[in-house]
Protein backbone atom coordinates (compact mmCIF):
# COMPACT_ATOMS: atom_id res chain seq x y z
CA UNK A 1 0.00 0.00 0.00
CA UNK A 2 1.16 3.51 -0.80
CA UNK A 3 1.00 6.03 2.02
CA UNK A 4 -1.30 9.03 1.68
CA UNK A 5 -0.30 12.14 3.59
CA UNK A 6 -2.96 14.30 5.23
CA UNK A 7 -1.89 17.63 6.64
CA UNK A 8 -3.82 19.54 9.25
CA UNK A 9 -3.28 22.63 11.34
CA UNK A 10 -2.72 22.33 15.09
CA UNK A 11 -5.87 23.15 17.04
CA UNK A 12 -8.13 22.62 14.05
CA UNK A 13 -9.96 19.56 12.72
CA UNK A 14 -8.50 17.20 10.16
CA UNK A 15 -10.67 14.98 8.02
CA UNK A 16 -9.17 11.81 6.58
CA UNK A 17 -10.98 9.93 3.82
CA UNK A 18 -10.40 6.32 2.84
CA UNK A 19 -12.14 5.18 -0.36
CA UNK A 20 -12.84 1.48 -0.89
CA UNK A 21 -14.78 -0.93 -3.09
CA UNK A 22 -18.21 -0.96 -1.45
CA UNK A 23 -19.09 -4.42 -2.77
CA UNK A 24 -15.78 -6.03 -1.89
CA UNK A 25 -16.12 -4.83 1.69
CA UNK A 26 -19.90 -5.18 1.96
CA UNK A 27 -21.02 -6.10 5.46
CA UNK A 28 -17.65 -5.40 7.00
CA UNK A 29 -17.13 -2.99 9.86
CA UNK A 30 -14.24 -0.54 9.59
CA UNK A 31 -11.60 0.74 11.95
CA UNK A 32 -8.93 3.42 12.33
CA UNK A 33 -5.71 2.36 13.99
CA UNK A 34 -2.35 3.89 14.83
CA UNK A 35 0.79 2.14 13.64
CA UNK A 36 3.21 1.51 16.50
CA UNK A 37 6.61 1.50 14.85
CA UNK A 38 7.48 0.39 11.33
CA UNK A 39 6.82 -3.31 11.98
CA UNK A 40 4.74 -3.01 15.12
CA UNK A 41 1.03 -3.67 15.57
CA UNK A 42 -1.67 -1.23 14.58
CA UNK A 43 -3.42 -0.10 17.75
CA UNK A 44 -7.17 0.38 17.33
CA UNK A 45 -8.27 3.95 17.94
CA UNK A 46 -11.92 3.76 16.94
CA UNK A 47 -14.20 1.47 14.95
CA UNK A 48 -17.57 1.87 13.27
CA UNK A 49 -20.85 0.89 14.88
CA UNK A 50 -21.13 -2.71 16.06
CA UNK A 51 -24.07 -3.12 13.68
CA UNK A 52 -22.83 -2.64 10.14
CA UNK A 53 -26.21 -1.24 9.03
CA UNK A 54 -25.61 1.65 11.44
CA UNK A 55 -22.09 2.39 10.22
CA UNK A 56 -23.22 5.82 9.03
CA UNK A 57 -23.60 6.89 12.67
CA UNK A 58 -20.55 8.81 13.82
CA UNK A 59 -18.67 7.15 16.67
CA UNK A 60 -16.19 8.99 18.85
CA UNK A 61 -13.22 7.93 20.91
CA UNK A 62 -11.88 11.01 22.60
CA UNK A 63 -11.20 13.54 19.86
CA UNK A 64 -11.33 11.01 17.01
CA UNK A 65 -14.54 10.22 15.13
CA UNK A 66 -15.33 7.65 12.45
CA UNK A 67 -18.22 7.29 10.03
CA UNK A 68 -18.73 5.01 7.04
CA UNK A 69 -20.62 5.64 3.83
CA UNK A 70 -21.11 1.98 3.00
CA UNK A 71 -22.94 2.63 -0.26
CA UNK A 72 -20.50 5.18 -1.62
CA UNK A 73 -17.50 3.32 -0.25
CA UNK A 74 -15.85 6.07 1.77
CA UNK A 75 -14.66 5.80 5.34
CA UNK A 76 -14.17 9.18 7.01
CA UNK A 77 -12.14 9.85 10.13
CA UNK A 78 -12.17 13.20 11.88
CA UNK A 79 -9.38 14.24 14.24
CA UNK A 80 -10.75 17.14 16.27
CA UNK A 81 -8.49 19.75 17.90
CA UNK A 82 -5.41 18.34 16.20
CA UNK A 83 -2.33 18.19 18.40
CA UNK A 84 1.36 17.55 17.64
CA UNK A 85 1.15 14.13 19.30
CA UNK A 86 -1.54 13.12 16.76
CA UNK A 87 1.08 13.11 14.01
CA UNK A 88 2.15 9.69 12.79
CA UNK A 89 1.27 6.71 10.70
CA UNK A 90 -2.27 5.28 10.73
CA UNK A 91 -4.37 2.76 8.81
CA UNK A 92 -7.96 2.58 7.67
CA UNK A 93 -9.04 -1.04 8.04
CA UNK A 94 -11.84 -3.32 6.92
CA UNK A 95 -12.72 -5.94 9.54
CA UNK A 96 -13.81 -9.51 8.93
CA UNK A 97 -13.80 -11.96 11.77
CA UNK A 98 -10.81 -11.04 13.92
CA UNK A 99 -8.82 -10.04 10.84
CA UNK A 100 -8.29 -6.63 9.27
CA UNK A 101 -7.53 -5.68 5.68
CA UNK A 102 -5.72 -2.39 5.13
CA UNK A 103 -7.78 0.01 3.03
CA UNK A 104 -5.29 2.87 3.16
CA UNK A 105 -2.09 3.81 4.97
CA UNK A 106 -2.22 7.38 6.19
CA UNK A 107 0.51 9.71 7.39
CA UNK A 108 -0.89 12.52 9.49
CA UNK A 109 1.22 15.68 9.58
CA UNK A 110 0.47 18.49 12.00
CA UNK A 111 1.31 21.98 10.76
CA UNK A 112 1.81 24.98 13.00
CA UNK A 113 -1.13 27.30 13.38
CA UNK A 114 0.00 30.45 11.52
CA UNK A 115 -1.89 32.54 14.07
CA UNK A 116 -0.11 30.84 16.98
CA UNK A 117 3.32 32.42 17.52
CA UNK A 118 4.46 29.93 20.15
CA UNK A 119 7.52 27.76 19.55
CA UNK A 120 6.74 25.26 16.79
CA UNK A 121 9.69 23.06 17.75
CA UNK A 122 7.48 20.27 19.03
CA UNK A 123 5.53 19.92 15.81
CA UNK A 124 6.24 16.66 13.99
CA UNK A 125 7.31 16.09 10.42
CA UNK A 126 8.78 12.94 8.92
CA UNK A 127 12.56 12.98 9.40
CA UNK A 128 15.01 12.47 6.59
CA UNK A 129 15.47 8.84 7.61
CA UNK A 130 11.76 8.13 7.18
CA UNK A 131 10.94 7.52 3.56
CA UNK A 132 7.39 7.28 2.31
CA UNK A 133 7.80 6.17 -1.26
CA UNK A 134 5.05 7.26 -3.62
CA UNK A 135 3.44 9.18 -0.78
CA UNK A 136 0.45 11.18 -1.94
CA UNK A 137 -0.23 14.43 -0.12
CA UNK A 138 -3.81 15.53 0.51
CA UNK A 139 -4.30 18.90 2.15
CA UNK A 140 -7.38 18.71 4.29
CA UNK A 141 -9.18 22.03 4.44
CA UNK A 142 -10.63 22.26 7.92
CA UNK A 143 -11.60 24.73 10.56
CA UNK A 144 -12.24 24.86 14.28
CA UNK A 145 -15.82 24.47 15.42
CA UNK A 146 -17.54 27.79 16.03
CA UNK A 147 -18.63 28.63 19.53
CA UNK A 148 -21.86 26.83 20.32
CA UNK A 149 -21.61 24.67 17.20
CA UNK A 150 -22.57 21.04 17.76
CA UNK A 151 -19.91 18.57 16.55
CA UNK A 152 -22.53 16.21 15.18
CA UNK A 153 -26.18 16.60 14.19
CA UNK A 154 -28.72 16.27 16.98
CA UNK A 155 -30.98 13.22 16.89
CA UNK A 156 -34.59 14.00 16.09
Amino acid sequence: HNTTVFQGVAGQSLQVSCPYDSMKHWGRRKAWCRQLGEKGPCQRVVSTHNLWLLSFLRRWNGSTAITDDTLGGTLTITLRNLQPHDAGLYQCQSLHGSEADTLRKVLVEVLADPLDHRDAGDLWFPGESESFEDAHVEHSISRSLLEGEIPFPPTS
Partner: antibody, heavy 123, light 107 residues
Protein backbone atom coordinates in the same frame (compact mmCIF):
# COMPACT_ATOMS: atom_id res chain seq x y z
CA UNK B 1 -31.24 -18.61 -8.79
CA UNK B 2 -27.64 -18.54 -7.57
CA UNK B 3 -25.60 -21.37 -9.07
CA UNK B 4 -21.96 -22.40 -9.17
CA UNK B 5 -21.27 -24.98 -11.88
CA UNK B 6 -17.91 -26.71 -11.89
CA UNK B 7 -16.06 -28.42 -14.72
CA UNK B 8 -16.14 -32.19 -15.04
CA UNK B 9 -14.05 -34.92 -13.43
CA UNK B 10 -10.41 -35.20 -14.46
CA UNK B 11 -7.99 -38.14 -14.55
CA UNK B 12 -4.36 -37.09 -14.80
CA UNK B 13 -0.86 -38.47 -14.47
CA UNK B 14 1.68 -37.19 -11.93
CA UNK B 15 3.60 -34.20 -13.28
CA UNK B 16 0.82 -33.06 -15.60
CA UNK B 17 -0.84 -29.66 -15.35
CA UNK B 18 -4.52 -29.01 -14.78
CA UNK B 19 -6.97 -26.11 -14.60
CA UNK B 20 -10.49 -26.64 -13.28
CA UNK B 21 -13.26 -24.05 -13.39
CA UNK B 22 -16.25 -22.75 -11.47
CA UNK B 23 -18.85 -20.67 -13.33
CA UNK B 24 -21.24 -18.49 -11.36
CA UNK B 25 -24.70 -17.37 -12.40
CA UNK B 26 -27.76 -15.74 -10.88
CA UNK B 27 -25.80 -13.04 -9.06
CA UNK B 28 -23.13 -10.38 -9.58
CA UNK B 29 -20.11 -12.67 -9.86
CA UNK B 30 -17.54 -9.90 -9.52
CA UNK B 31 -18.97 -8.73 -6.20
CA UNK B 32 -18.54 -11.85 -4.06
CA UNK B 33 -15.44 -13.68 -2.93
CA UNK B 34 -15.01 -17.24 -4.23
CA UNK B 35 -13.22 -19.87 -2.14
CA UNK B 36 -11.78 -23.24 -3.10
CA UNK B 37 -12.10 -26.15 -0.68
CA UNK B 38 -10.46 -29.57 -0.93
CA UNK B 39 -11.95 -32.83 0.32
CA UNK B 40 -9.67 -35.83 0.13
CA UNK B 41 -11.34 -39.27 -0.13
CA UNK B 42 -13.25 -40.01 3.07
CA UNK B 43 -11.81 -36.94 4.79
CA UNK B 44 -12.81 -33.50 5.97
CA UNK B 45 -12.85 -30.10 4.31
CA UNK B 46 -9.76 -27.93 3.79
CA UNK B 47 -9.85 -24.27 2.82
CA UNK B 48 -7.31 -23.66 0.06
CA UNK B 49 -7.73 -19.98 -0.64
CA UNK B 50 -10.07 -17.28 -1.85
CA UNK B 51 -10.33 -14.71 -4.64
CA UNK B 52 -12.32 -11.55 -5.22
CA UNK B 53 -13.14 -11.63 -8.95
CA UNK B 54 -13.78 -7.88 -9.01
CA UNK B 55 -10.07 -7.11 -8.73
CA UNK B 56 -8.48 -10.60 -8.51
CA UNK B 57 -7.32 -10.02 -4.93
CA UNK B 58 -6.25 -13.52 -3.86
CA UNK B 59 -5.41 -15.06 -0.48
CA UNK B 60 -4.01 -18.55 0.06
CA UNK B 61 -3.88 -20.95 2.97
CA UNK B 62 -0.21 -21.41 3.91
CA UNK B 63 -0.69 -25.14 3.26
CA UNK B 64 -1.55 -24.48 -0.38
CA UNK B 65 0.56 -21.39 -1.13
CA UNK B 66 2.87 -22.21 -4.02
CA UNK B 67 1.10 -25.51 -4.69
CA UNK B 68 -1.87 -24.13 -6.62
CA UNK B 69 -2.91 -20.94 -8.39
CA UNK B 70 -6.33 -19.37 -7.96
CA UNK B 71 -7.54 -16.96 -10.63
CA UNK B 72 -10.76 -15.53 -12.02
CA UNK B 73 -12.18 -13.90 -15.12
CA UNK B 74 -15.12 -11.77 -14.10
CA UNK B 75 -16.07 -11.07 -17.74
CA UNK B 76 -17.16 -14.71 -18.05
CA UNK B 77 -18.08 -15.15 -14.36
CA UNK B 78 -15.57 -17.93 -13.86
CA UNK B 79 -13.03 -18.78 -11.18
CA UNK B 80 -10.18 -21.23 -11.67
CA UNK B 81 -7.96 -23.53 -9.68
CA UNK B 82 -4.81 -24.76 -11.35
CA UNK B 83 -1.78 -26.98 -10.82
CA UNK B 84 1.44 -26.84 -12.81
CA UNK B 85 2.61 -30.30 -11.72
CA UNK B 86 0.14 -32.70 -10.16
CA UNK B 87 1.00 -35.24 -7.48
CA UNK B 88 -0.83 -38.41 -6.47
CA UNK B 89 -1.65 -36.67 -3.17
CA UNK B 90 -3.70 -34.07 -5.09
CA UNK B 91 -6.35 -36.75 -5.68
CA UNK B 92 -9.49 -35.25 -4.12
CA UNK B 93 -12.82 -33.60 -4.68
CA UNK B 94 -12.50 -29.84 -5.14
CA UNK B 95 -15.36 -27.48 -4.38
CA UNK B 96 -15.75 -23.81 -5.13
CA UNK B 97 -17.97 -21.84 -2.79
CA UNK B 98 -19.32 -18.31 -2.71
CA UNK B 99 -18.23 -16.44 0.37
CA UNK B 100 -20.84 -14.06 1.70
CA UNK B 101 -20.32 -11.52 4.44
CA UNK B 102 -23.24 -11.44 6.84
CA UNK B 103 -23.61 -7.96 8.26
CA UNK B 104 -24.80 -9.35 11.60
CA UNK B 105 -21.22 -10.13 12.58
CA UNK B 106 -19.01 -8.83 9.75
CA UNK B 107 -17.58 -12.21 8.90
CA UNK B 108 -17.93 -14.42 5.86
CA UNK B 109 -19.50 -17.83 5.37
CA UNK B 110 -19.92 -20.12 2.37
CA UNK B 111 -23.55 -19.85 1.35
CA UNK B 112 -23.50 -21.49 -2.12
CA UNK B 113 -21.31 -24.34 -3.32
CA UNK B 114 -20.46 -25.89 -6.66
CA UNK B 115 -21.18 -29.57 -7.17
CA UNK B 116 -17.49 -30.44 -6.93
CA UNK B 117 -14.84 -31.58 -9.39
CA UNK B 118 -13.22 -34.95 -8.76
CA UNK B 119 -9.53 -34.93 -9.63
CA UNK B 120 -7.76 -38.29 -9.80
CA UNK B 121 -3.99 -38.35 -10.18
CA UNK B 122 -2.57 -41.77 -10.89
CA UNK B 123 0.24 -43.22 -12.94
CA UNK C 1 -4.02 -22.05 12.53
CA UNK C 2 -7.10 -22.52 14.66
CA UNK C 3 -7.92 -26.19 15.26
CA UNK C 4 -11.57 -27.21 15.31
CA UNK C 5 -12.47 -30.43 17.14
CA UNK C 6 -15.88 -32.03 16.81
CA UNK C 7 -17.44 -34.65 19.02
CA UNK C 8 -18.62 -37.27 18.67
CA UNK C 9 -17.05 -38.35 15.36
CA UNK C 10 -20.14 -40.44 14.72
CA UNK C 11 -23.51 -40.85 16.35
CA UNK C 12 -26.38 -43.29 15.82
CA UNK C 13 -29.90 -42.05 16.38
CA UNK C 14 -33.50 -42.67 15.40
CA UNK C 15 -36.10 -40.51 13.67
CA UNK C 16 -37.61 -38.17 16.25
CA UNK C 17 -34.54 -38.15 18.48
CA UNK C 18 -32.85 -35.01 19.74
CA UNK C 19 -29.20 -34.90 18.71
CA UNK C 20 -26.43 -32.61 19.88
CA UNK C 21 -23.05 -32.19 18.19
CA UNK C 22 -20.29 -30.13 19.77
CA UNK C 23 -17.40 -28.21 18.29
CA UNK C 24 -14.45 -26.81 20.19
CA UNK C 25 -12.00 -24.21 18.89
CA UNK C 26 -8.35 -24.21 19.96
CA UNK C 27 -8.70 -20.49 20.76
CA UNK C 28 -11.53 -18.04 21.20
CA UNK C 29 -13.38 -17.23 17.99
CA UNK C 30 -16.18 -15.06 19.41
CA UNK C 31 -19.34 -16.15 17.52
CA UNK C 32 -17.62 -16.56 14.16
CA UNK C 33 -18.71 -20.13 13.54
CA UNK C 34 -20.73 -21.94 10.87
CA UNK C 35 -22.29 -25.40 10.63
CA UNK C 36 -22.63 -27.29 7.33
CA UNK C 37 -24.45 -30.46 6.36
CA UNK C 38 -23.00 -32.77 3.71
CA UNK C 39 -24.61 -35.79 2.15
CA UNK C 40 -22.59 -38.45 0.27
CA UNK C 41 -21.47 -37.27 -3.18
CA UNK C 42 -22.89 -33.80 -2.60
CA UNK C 43 -21.54 -30.38 -1.72
CA UNK C 44 -21.82 -29.04 1.83
CA UNK C 45 -24.85 -26.91 2.66
CA UNK C 46 -24.77 -23.95 5.03
CA UNK C 47 -27.12 -24.48 7.99
CA UNK C 48 -26.02 -22.02 10.67
CA UNK C 49 -23.77 -18.95 10.57
CA UNK C 50 -22.63 -16.54 13.28
CA UNK C 51 -22.96 -19.48 15.72
CA UNK C 52 -26.73 -19.25 16.02
CA UNK C 53 -28.27 -17.63 12.91
CA UNK C 54 -30.20 -20.05 10.71
CA UNK C 55 -29.61 -19.77 6.97
CA UNK C 56 -32.66 -19.08 4.81
CA UNK C 57 -34.67 -22.22 4.12
CA UNK C 58 -33.13 -24.26 6.92
CA UNK C 59 -35.78 -25.96 9.10
CA UNK C 60 -36.28 -24.61 12.61
CA UNK C 61 -35.36 -27.98 14.14
CA UNK C 62 -31.73 -26.99 13.52
CA UNK C 63 -30.29 -24.59 16.07
CA UNK C 64 -26.83 -23.44 17.03
CA UNK C 65 -25.42 -21.96 20.20
CA UNK C 66 -22.17 -21.06 21.91
CA UNK C 67 -19.41 -18.47 21.77
CA UNK C 68 -15.73 -18.29 22.51
CA UNK C 69 -14.42 -21.83 22.20
CA UNK C 70 -17.44 -24.10 22.71
CA UNK C 71 -20.29 -24.48 20.25
CA UNK C 72 -23.27 -26.77 19.79
CA UNK C 73 -25.47 -27.82 16.90
CA UNK C 74 -28.80 -29.28 17.99
CA UNK C 75 -31.36 -31.11 15.87
CA UNK C 76 -34.49 -31.12 17.99
CA UNK C 77 -36.37 -33.94 16.24
CA UNK C 78 -34.46 -35.96 13.66
CA UNK C 79 -36.03 -36.41 10.25
CA UNK C 80 -34.98 -39.08 7.71
CA UNK C 81 -33.30 -36.44 5.50
CA UNK C 82 -31.07 -35.30 8.38
CA UNK C 83 -28.84 -38.36 8.27
CA UNK C 84 -25.59 -36.90 6.90
CA UNK C 85 -22.20 -35.61 7.99
CA UNK C 86 -21.99 -32.28 9.82
CA UNK C 87 -18.99 -29.94 9.85
CA UNK C 88 -18.26 -26.86 11.91
CA UNK C 89 -16.06 -24.08 10.48
CA UNK C 90 -14.44 -21.07 12.10
CA UNK C 91 -14.78 -17.72 10.34
CA UNK C 92 -12.52 -15.90 12.78
CA UNK C 93 -9.26 -15.89 10.84
CA UNK C 94 -7.39 -17.29 7.86
CA UNK C 95 -6.86 -19.99 7.01
CA UNK C 96 -10.49 -20.89 7.57
CA UNK C 97 -10.57 -24.30 9.23
CA UNK C 98 -13.20 -27.01 9.57
CA UNK C 99 -13.88 -29.66 12.16
CA UNK C 100 -13.22 -33.25 11.12
CA UNK C 101 -16.94 -33.96 10.80
CA UNK C 102 -19.62 -35.85 12.69
CA UNK C 103 -21.40 -38.64 10.85
CA UNK C 104 -25.03 -38.98 11.86
CA UNK C 105 -26.25 -42.52 11.16
CA UNK C 106 -29.58 -44.30 11.48
CA UNK C 107 -29.78 -46.54 14.55
Amino acid sequence: EVQLVQSGAEVKKPGESLKISCKGSGYSFGSYWIAWVRQMPGKGLEWMGIIYPGDSDTRYSPSFQGQVTISADKSISTAYLQWSSLKASDTAMYFCARSRTFYYDSSDYFDYWGQGTLVTVSS
Amino acid sequence: DIQMTQSPSSVSASVGDRVTITCRASQGISSWLAWYQQKPGKAPKLLIYAASSRQNGVPSRFSGSGSGTDFTLTISSLQPEDFATYFCQQADSSPRTFGQGTKLEIK
